[in-house]
Amino acid sequence: KLLQVSTIAMQQQEKLIQQERALLNFTEWKRSCALQMKYCQAFMQNSLSSAHNSSPCPNNWIQNRESCYYVSEIWSIWHTSQENCLKEGSTLLQIESKEEMDFITGSLRKIKGSYDYWVGLSQDGHSGRWLWQDGSSPSPGLLPAERSQSANQVCGYVKSNSLLSSNCSTWKYFICEKYALRSSV
């Protein structure tokens, strides 16, 4: 009889320990949830306030219609320029029209003067076709003037009012482009 009572007592003790453990886990889980909730709320608040205060383009970017442009202050080869733009959530400049070309060249004149700036244009090694980096073809009026006699890969750049070509491994400034944020107001 005594042995039976002792066994029951031990079982109850074990049950109590398990319940305490469960309570501890639950408390820990609740605390973790509260922290996550706090973090999510802070993140949302941050996002909302930054969205509320945000202009269509980030600081130091220039806006024209639906696009934002960033004119680099460093030199790099074409491939590194491409990666530098991606880091900013953008791609190398893709010029869609003469109007866009005029805006870019006009802005460059104001900012920096006559330097070389990589854009997102490269020449296919096999076919010799010029393609923007998204795979589309430039409009006929926006083909680089033949200037590069390079055996290496050839890429496009802007200088003054012209679109020119050069060995992709030469160092130049570059221009990044991203879509402007649409105002929800």
Epitope: F43, L86, K87, E88, G89, S90, D134, G135, K178, Y179
Partner: nanobody, 116 residues
Framework: QVQLQESGGGLVQPGGSLKLSCAAS????????MGWYRQAPGKQRELVAA???????TYADSAKNRFTISRENTRNTVHLQMSSLKAEDTAVYYC??????????WGQGTQVTVSS
């Protein structure tokens, strides 16, 4: 910390197709861009394709008109559909992500072998 998990690599015959996928997890709410690099034996790692958070695309010359990069609406998964595969496409393909704080993270890589 951000984790990237690639899948879909394997052995394929020349002219065949393959779809690579990459899922990002961990402390990630949004990103600046996601993409794919590849590294063939004895060569440097090179960018194959990337997609920005705004949906702008960029492809290496070798990938244009053969590969298509896309993103799932969850925005944390990126796919690379590869077609007309050639022996030169044989490489380890790495998924990458540029986060809002301009950090770049890498996946472990998935092997793609194009051979008959």
């Amino acid at each position: 910390q951000v984790q990237l998990q690639e899948s879909g690599g394997g052995l394929v015959q020349p002219g065949g197709s393959l779809k690579l996928s990459c899922a990002a997890s961990g402390s990630i709410f949004s990103f600046n861009a996601m993409g794919w690099y590849r590294q063939a034996p004895g060569k440097q790692r090179e960018l194959v394709a990337a997609i920005t958070d705004g949906g702008r695309l960029t492809y290496a010359d070798s990938a244009k008109n053969r590969f298509t990069i896309s993103r799932e609406n969850t925005r944390n998964t990126v796919h690379l559909q590869m077609s007309s595969l050639k022996a030169e496409d044989t490489a380890v393909y790495y998924c990458t992500i540029w986060t809002k704080d301009r950090q770049q993270y890498w996946g472990q890589g998935t092997q793609v072998t194009v051979s008959s």
